[in-house]
Interface confidence: low
């Protein structure tokens, strides 16, 4: 017979990232004596909630319960009964609901309260739903890919754990990229910022870190989408919307109740002669990346450089991590090699977009509909956003790493919100360090 | 309270140019559809065309010989009329309001208006 | 483009009575998703830009005296001046703003008997 390990004692912590598209729910375990060392906490599961983002739940509040059952359930199982009371479970509602509170704190403070009386009911020791800021969402996917990386780590490691990690002890940029906004997160090189909104100070294990965050509100993949059909239809001559970022031969009616319901159209919304327009795709890259150019306002500047819309943007510093719809988006693409290059992401584009609609649901036959339509459109859009929004080059491409785990765990800020929330991320670095850290990366 | 200042008035010949300003305060300006409407002594109100985040639009009589921009640095809205001629004398005002960006609420902020007289 | 056509051109009525102004259409500008009529009444006095009184046919903007009414669905409309007083002397404009290219009515003098 085998020698038993001792059982370790484990703990766990449950973070649900109420997002604009849908809700995800991540268990993590870490062993209890090192929970203050760098890369010992790892996601054992992701639950993704069937159904849309919570804020879609405002006129169904009702319906919330339900909806969260599921997932809620799940991490009943995953998680030892005998550990249910001391689990913390944290739910954090991102640019969603920043936009629904924008037209009615009240009715997102009613989805909220649905919400947290719903996870109240689980065995868990939950701590309370939130609309974290767009700061916090970029600070905390920093976090998390640096923590993952061992950034944090006083030690050099011999090996490599991830084929991007350097060993040394630069930290990665983050680039996160959701349905309603898209962040951006990195240590300048120089460490005096034009824009004290967009700085944050950090002391993690010892170290100081002047970190520099942007989060756009309505330039996440869907909201960005909605605001170029907003302005590509004021100026359509009737209910026939051509549009270059969809295949030739895609069509899809959109209501222009649906296209005015969010506040990211606003800015475009005028009065249309019709309730319904149609989509026609004709496929075409270059035209969809120029009229994806057009939603990035670069004529006004207050400061030495800006990305768009007279945002402070720091020169480029350093590598990223490009992850969540970066990272889904161009993995489907088959863009996520190191080995390729931006001309050739820009020429694989164009190729992938002018194909015919229905020579692309037969090729990818088991992807929804609605999802598959929208490729053309996004892979666009965040090579738009990368090298006009933020100014990256066909040299600095290099230093962008499309990043979906880590080690197991889900590049995001979900990690890094339990790491804070939970006191796991010391100020100072720990006195000892044990020999076995890196067993538990 | 925004505020829409126009510069002042302007004496052309025939087949020249003339470029109105219209300076916006105490508002975002890039959230300011504005709109320019022209009345010739006597008569009734013209709409010429507007701008809004960066798109131009023109009424079709004007097509081609009216440009509209924005200056978002300095919060101005320009109107150039090219190919005069004298019946292009007339007030020309800036509004805050209407083009393409629906103006919901109509033209609700008005500049002074600028005098342009067209004479050889 | 809509035709606005305005009557009569010109009105004299004496102080304290009722004043009305017709404006119509050549189609409809009520929007049908949200309710709303985009229609806009405007008041110019001589040498002075023109000033909003009235949009959404029937909504008072800001600081416009309760005097001044608008009503009207589609493609008919009336601007409605309950008591006219002295400062009420001017040229009344409707415009629509439903479609382009935005258009103006001819005008409405509207002057003391």
């Known amino acids: 017979t085998q020698n038993k390990a001792l059982p370790e004692n484990i703990k766990y912590g449950i973070v649900l990232d109420a997002g604009s598209s849908h809700t995800s729910l991540y268990i993590y375990k870490w062993p209890a004596e090192k929970e203050n060392d760098t890369g010992v906490v790892h996601q054992v599961e992701e639950c993704r909630v069937k159904g849309p983002g919570i804020s879609k739940y405002v006129q169904k509040v009702n319906e919330i319960g339900i909806y969260l059952t599921d997932c809620m359930e799940r991490a009943r199982e995953v998680i030892p009964r005998s550990q249910h009371q001391e689990t913390p479970v944290y739910l954090g509602a991102t640019a969603g609901m920043r936009l629904l509170r924008m037209e009615s704190e009240e009715l997102a403070d009613r989805v909220l309260d649905v919400v947290e009386r719903s996870l109240s009911n689980y065995p868990f020791d939950f701590q309370g739903a939130r609309i974290i800021t767009g700061q916090e969402e970029g600070a905390y996917g920093w976090i998390t890919i640096n923590y993952l990386l061992g950034k944090f780590s006083q030690k050099t490691r011999w090996f490599s754990i991830v084929p991007y990690e350097t060993n040394n002890q630069e930290t990665f940029g983050a680039l996160d990229l959701g349905g309603a906004s898209t962040q951006i997160t990195f240590v300048p090189q120089n460490q005096t910022t034009e824009s004290p909104d967009n700085a944050l100070q950090f002391r993690l294990y010892g170290k100081d870190y002047n970190v520099y965050t942007h989060s756009f509100l309505c330039y996440g993949k869907d909201q960005a989408l909605w605001q170029k059909l907003a302005k590509d239809i004021q100026v359509a001559s009737n209910e026939i919307l051509r549009d270059p970022c969809f295949h030739p031969g895609y069509k899809k009616v959109v209501n222009v109740s649906d296209l005015y319901k969010t506040p990211c159209t606003k800015r475009f919304e005028m009065t249309l002669p019709f309730q319904q327009f149609e989509i026609q795709g004709i496929g075409n890259y270059q035209q969809c990346h120029q009229s994806v150019l057009e939603l990035f306002n670069t004529s006004y500047c207050p400061y030495s450089q800006c990305a768009f819309n007279g945002i402070f943007l720091p020169p480029l510093q350093g590598d990223f991590g490009a992850f969540s719809a970066f990272y889904f988006v161009m993995n489907f693409l088959n863009l996520t090699s190191e080995k390729v290059s931006q001309e050739k992401v820009t020429e694989m584009m164009k190729k992938f977009c002018s194909q015919p609609w229905e020579e692309i649901k037969t090729s990818y036959a088991g992807v929804k509909e609605k999802y598959l339509s929208e490729y053309c459109f996004s892979g666009t859009y965040i090579l738009s956003l990368l090298l006009q929004g933020y100014h990256f080059t066909a040299d600095s491409w290099e230093h962008i790493h499309f990043i979906g785990k880590i080690q197991g765990s889900d590049a995001g800020w979900t990690l890094g919100y339990m790491l804070n929330l939970t006191n796991m991320i010391p100020a100072e670095q720990p006195l000892s360090t044990p020999l076995s850290h890196s067993t538990y990366v | 309270q925004v505020q829409l200042v126009q510069s002042g008035a302007e004496v052309k010949k025939p087949g020249s140019s003339v470029k109105v300003s219209c300076k916006a305060s105490?508002?975002?300006?890039?959230?300011?559809?504005i709109s320019w409407v022209r009345q010739a002594p006597g008569q009734g109100l013209e709409w010429m065309g507007g701008?809004?985040?960066?798109?131009?639009n023109y009424a079709q009589k004007f097509q081609g010989r009216v440009t509209i921009t924005a200056d978002e640095s300095t919060s101005t809205a320009y109107m150039e009329l090219s190919s005069l001629r004298s019946e292009d004398t007339a007030v020309y005002y800036c509004?805050?309001?209407?083009?393409?960006?629906?103006?919901?609420?109509?033209?609700?902020?008005w500049g002074q208006g600028t005098t342009v007289t067209v004479s050889s | 483009g809509i035709v606005m056509t305005q009557s009569p051109d010109s009105l004299a009525v004496s102080l304290g009575e009722r004043a009305t102004i017709n404006c119509k259409s050549s189609q409809s500008v009520l929007f049908s998703s949200n309710n709303k009529n985009y229609l806009a009444w405007y008041q110019q006095k001589p040498g002075q830009p023109p000033k909003l009184l009235i949009y959404w046919a029937s909504t008072r903007a800001s600081g416009v005296p309760d005097r001044f009414s608008g009503s009207g669905s589609g493609t008919d409309f009336t601007l409605t001046i309950s008591s006219l007083q002295a400062e009420d002397v001017a040229v009344y404009y409707c415009?629509?703003?439903?479609?382009?290219?935005?258009?103006f009515g001819g005008g409405t003098k509207v002057e003391i008997k």
């Open positions: 415009q629509q703003y439903y479609l382009y290219p935005l258009t």
């Open positions: 105490g508002g975002t300006f890039s959230s300011l559809p």
């Open positions: 509004a805050r309001g209407g083009a393409k960006y629906a103006g919901r609420y109509g033209m609700d902020v």
């Open positions: 701008i809004g985040f960066g798109t131009a």
